[in-house]
Each structure stands twice: as structure tokens, then as C-alpha cells.
Interface confidence: medium
């Protein structure tokens, strides 16, 4: 069969080959597409429903007016010229939408080196098939899961275009003493060839980095931040420096509000206290000072714990990551 | 089972402070917050502020920084409000509750209310 | 302060019925995948009881015919199918930053 890409909401027209260029003609159009139930047929005589979604043309050619996901599928001709010989036409269409060029949405202006950081979210809406975005720094692309790189995506379909929006937010782990004005981009590549990627406008957040003070060592009770539904958390900050400083929490990179206190308890564990902690140290006379970030999650019974919470990795491309 | 059990109701003279308590049973009293909350008659709810009875660490509405005073005592596991300086804007009933830690930061068990009436 | 706008102020419902009631914030309480909006009942003379919290999550004890929905600055709390016991006023409460506050409250009468 011979592949066809069309562009929905434009016409499209298959050639029935053999066929005489005039009536009379002897020949017929089998669909199998997502408006048929098995195999539709269509002559050139026409009329009907049909005729609004596809027709034979006086040529002998199919013509669709304005293609739509549900014409995806089959589509073939069988033609009988003047002198009895039989020809076969056979297509495979597949139809796309390129969507408007993605956005990074809810960007931050500035990145706070050694601790995870929404970088932003990217947004693209209207494609067909759903395609893929992709994160780049300083333009070469950054690879999830790597070297403090985390993506959450999440695809949603129109209920009635039947088009896709695609989101993902970008966390990224900055190290001291990397590049203090990373480039980050996003890209969508769609899911049929031939279409070349498009890409946001770039995004330049500050790197922000904390005074290096003496370590804060957040210890958590138990070890290594898994705990049983039910079971209670406790999280410990402590700071060497004399005097003692104020202690402040965050969740998933949020300060918590809550009164300054070297210790978090987290009793009656729910899925909800899930996430990544850190504490805040604010000194006097210095600035604040955030300690490495653990991950707190729920284990069912009979699954074995992670046997660290702590949170992190290494270097990566010209912006560090921790 | 649960409690927040709160001291009876006070009338006192406009200038004056008042301490109210809170006693928490059934639960590790350090494990979360002290909430108190004010509710004037027919009115409707206000927070006053939280302390973290393990830290003693405290927040308050700056609506009432000068005005109220909270405390907790871990030995006996009573969170107190002091109040001073009172005139008939403080008359009201005023509510402890327990709050969780972490984020989730709702009121999932409350005192019944001691009622404060200033009057001369 | 972040100001929370119960509507309506007082509804009268029949039994059985739907009793649904709005909150609105001055500026987003949502934030890291959560809704910070809470719901309490309270009856004359009694403290406020948390019904739902995190804008969708029920409170262990509470019946099924409460739910909560919502996320950014727009929340509601629905009954159904309401019952003569839940005559009582409700509160919407968030605590996505200092200092907490609450609604004005909704007074459901039952009719």
C-alpha cells in the first residue's frame, strides 16, 4: 500500500489508477476507515451521507473535502479499463495536525544551585498524532532521570477535536559553581515524519547560590525515608553553627508554613506527605542555607525500602547539576 | 481516643489578661501543631496563630501579635493563650485545634471553645 | 491576606436534594499538584468538624454524600442527597499561605 499523510481539515484526493478518465467506468472504492464498520463501498453513482465525506469524482478519483482522524485507515481502488483489464489501487492515509509552537509556561527566574528546581513547564496544544517534547540546555538535549534531570509529562485528548496537548515540567538539580545563566529550551518533535521539530523561545533563569556555610545534615527517622502507610516520619535538622539558627522546611521545593523548628514530624503518613524535604537554616549574619533534600515515600507491606532518601546525581553539560 | 479538652469560660475586666489552656490526649502532642481560632458571636472564624509544642515555635496572624501569646507545656501536654490587654472586642469564643505538620496543614480535631466575656 | 467569598450566605434546600456551595480565593491556593482549601461544618454551640481537606479528600467519619472540588481560586462543596442532620453552617478554610483564614461561612437550612 502507499503511504499518504494529510493534513486534517484540508481535501485530499486518491487517484484510482487504470480507471478511464471518463464515464462510463467500471470500478469501485473500498474504505476501511475510523467512520466504517468493516469495509464501506463507494461507486461513482455516489449520493447519500457519503457524499459529504467522500466522493468519487468524475475521473474516477476519490475526493475528500476536509480530512479528519476518523479517515485514517484503507482506502482502495479497483478499476476496469475499456478493454477489460483490472487495476488496483491501495493507500494507507494517515492524517497529522501540527499544533501552535509550544510555551514555557510558569517559568522561574531563578534557580537555587544544589536543590531541585521547577525550571517551568512546557505546553504544546493541537497536535496529531500526540508527538513529543523534549528538554534542552545550552542546546543539546537533556536526558530525564540523569544527573539530577526529572520530567513529569502528561498528554490530554480533546473530547471533541480529538487533538492532543502535551505538558511537562522540567526539575532540574543546579551545581555550585556551574554556569550561573543556563539557556533552557523545549522542543516539539510530532509523531509523523518529515515535520521538523518546533521549538520555544529559550529561557535564561539565574543560578542562585547559597553562602557555603558549615554542612546542614538533615537525619531521618527511619533511615532512608520509607515508611509503611500509617507510620510516623521525623526529620531532623542540624546545624553546627553557634548560635542556633532558624530552622525552616520545604516540601517538593515550597517552603512549608510552619514554625521554626529543628524537627518535622510527619505522623499518620498519607500518600499525600509524599515527596522531597529539606530544611532551611537562616543565620544571622549569614544568608540561608539549605540542606540536601530527601525523599519521603510510602511502602506497602512486603516491599523493601529504598536504602537512601537522599536525592541527587552529578555534573551535566555546561549547567551542573548535584 | 482524640482530645482537645479546653478550660471553662472566664469574665473579666477590660485591661486585664486571661490564659486559656488546652489539653491534648490520645495522640503524641509533639507530634503536631496547636491551632487557636476565634469566633466572635454570630461571627464567623479568625486564626490567631500556631505553636509547634515540641520547638516551642510560634506563628501568628499579625492581626493579633501584642494580643495573644501562645505557649506549650510538653510535661503535661497543655497548650495555653494568654491574652492581654483586653477590651469587648476580645469577648468571643476562641477554639483550639490540632494541626497537622508536613503540608497538609488542615484542623482535623478541635477543643469545644472556651467562651471570654470582658465586661466591667 | 490571601480573602475567601462563601456564596450564597444562607441557602434553603429540601431533603434529598443537592446543596452546593462555592468559596472563592482573592488569588490561587493550588500549588505543587495540591489544593490547599478545607471544609468544616458547625452546628450552634458546638466547635467546627473538617470535612473535607485538600479540596477533594474526605475526613474519615464523614458520610459520602459530602464531596469537594476544585483547584486554583474557584472551590465548592456539594451535599447530596442532603439530610435533616446536616443543618448547620460550613466554612471553607485555606492554608496555602500566612496567615490561615476562612470563608464568611454558608448557613443550610433544610426545608
Known amino acids: 500500500a502507499q503511504n499518504i499523510t494529510a493534513r486534517i481539515g484540508e481535501p485530499l484526493v486518491l487517484k484510482c489508477k487504470g480507471a478511464p478518465k471518463k464515464p462510463p467506468q467500471r470500478l469501485e472504492w473500498k474504505l476501511n476507515t475510523g467512520r466504517t464498520e468493516a469495509w464501506k463501498v463507494l461507486s461513482p453513482q455516489g449520493g447519500g451521507p457519503w457524499d459529504s465525506v467522500a466522493r468519487v469524482l468524475p475521473n474516477g478519483s476519490l475526493f475528500l473535502p476536509a480530512v479528519g482522524i476518523q479517515d485514517e485507515g484503507i482506502f482502495r481502488c479497483q478499476a476496469m479499463n475499456r478493454n477489460g483489464k483490472e487495476t488496483k489501487s491501495n493507500y494507507r492515509v494517515r492524517v497529522y495536525q501540527i499544533p501552535g509552537k509550544p510555551e514555557i509556561v510558569d517559568s522561574a527566574s531563578e534557580l537555587t544551585a544544589g536543590v531541585p528546581n521547577k525550571v517551568g513547564t512546557c505546553v504544546s496544544e493541537g497536535s496529531y498524532p500526540a508527538g513529543t517534547l523534549s528538554w534542552h540546555l545550552d542546546g543539546k538535549p537533556l536526558v530525564p532521570n540523569e544527573k539530577g534531570v526529572s520530567v513529569k509529562e502528561q498528554t490530554r485528548r480533546h473530547p471533541e477535536t480529538g487533538l492532543f496537548t502535551l505538558q511537562s515540567e522540567l526539575m532540574v538539580t543546579p551545581a555550585r559553581g556551574g554556569d550561573p545563566r543556563p539557556t533552557f529550551s523545549c522542543s516539539f518533535s510530532p509523531g509523523l515524519p518529515r515535520h521538523r521539530a518546533l521549538r520555544t523561545a529559550p529561557i535564561q533563569p539565574r543560578v542562585w547560590e547559597p553562602v557555603p556555610l558549615e554542612e546542614v545534615q538533615l537525619v531521618v527517622e527511619p533511615e532512608g525515608g520509607a515508611v509503611a502507610p500509617g507510620g510516623t516520619v521525623t526529620l531532623t535538622c542540624e546545624v553546627p553553627a553557634q548560635p542556633s539558627p532558624q530552622i525552616h522546611w520545604m516540601k517538593d521545593g515550597v517552603p512549608l508554613p510552619l514554625p521554626p523548628s529543628p524537627v518535622l514530624i510527619l505522623p499518620e503518613i498519607g500518600p499525600q506527605d509524599q515527596g522531597t524535604y529539606s530544611c532551611v537554616a537562616t543565620h544571622s549574619s549569614h544568608g540561608p542555607q539549605e540542606s540536601r533534600a530527601v525523599s519521603i515515600s510510602i511502602i506497602e507491606p512486603g516491599e523493601e525500602g529504598p536504602t537512601a532518601g537522599s536525592v541527587g546525581g552529578s555534573g551535566l553539560g555546561t549547567l551542573a547539576l548535584a | 481516643q482524640v482530645q482537645l479538652q479546653q478550660s471553662g469560660a472566664e469574665l473579666v475586666r477590660p485591661g486585664t489578661s486571661v490564659k486559656v489552656s488546652c489539653k491534648a490526649s490520645?495522640?503524641?502532642?509533639?507530634?503536631?501543631?496547636i491551632e487557636w481560632v476565634k469566633q466572635r458571636p454570630g461571627q464567623g472564624l479568625e486564626w490567631i496563630g500556631m505553636i509547634n509544642p515540641g520547638s516551642g515555635g510560634t506563628n501568628y496572624n499579625e492581626k493579633f501579635k501584642g494580643k495573644a501569646t501562645l505557649t506549650a507545656d510538653k510535661s503535661s501536654s497543655t497548650a495555653y493563650m494568654q491574652l492581654s490587654s483586653l477590651t469587648s472586642d476580645d469577648s468571643a469564643v476562641y477554639f483550639c485545634a490540632r494541626g497537622r505538620g508536613g503540608h497538609y496543614r488542615y484542623f482535623d480535631v478541635w477543643g469545644a471553645g472556651t467562651t471570654v466575656t470582658v465586661s466591667s | 491576606d490571601i480573602v475567601l467569598t462563601q456564596s450564597p450566605a444562607s441557602l434553603a434546600v429540601s431533603l434529598g436534594q443537592r446543596a452546593t456551595i462555592s468559596c472563592r480565593a482573592s488569588k490561587s491556593v493550588s500549588t505543587s499538584g495540591y489544593s490547599y482549601m478545607h471544609w468544616y461544618q458547625q452546628k450552634p454551640g458546638q466547635p467546627p468538624k473538617l470535612l473535607i481537606y485538600?479540596?477533594?479528600h474526605l475526613e474519615s467519619g464523614v458520610p459520602a454524600r459530602f464531596s469537594g472540588s476544585g483547584s486554583g481560586t474557584d472551590f465548592s462543596l456539594n451535599i447530596h442527597p442532603v439530610e435533616e442532620e446536616d443543618a448547620a453552617t460550613y466554612y471553607c478554610?485555606?492554608?496555602?499561605?500566612?496567615?490561615?483564614?476562612f470563608g464568611g461561612g454558608t448557613k443550610l437550612e433544610i426545608k
Open positions: 490520645g495522640y503524641a502532642f509533639t507530634n503536631y501543631l
Open positions: 478554610q485555606h492554608s496555602r499561605e500566612l496567615p490561615w483564614t
Open positions: 485538600l479540596a477533594s
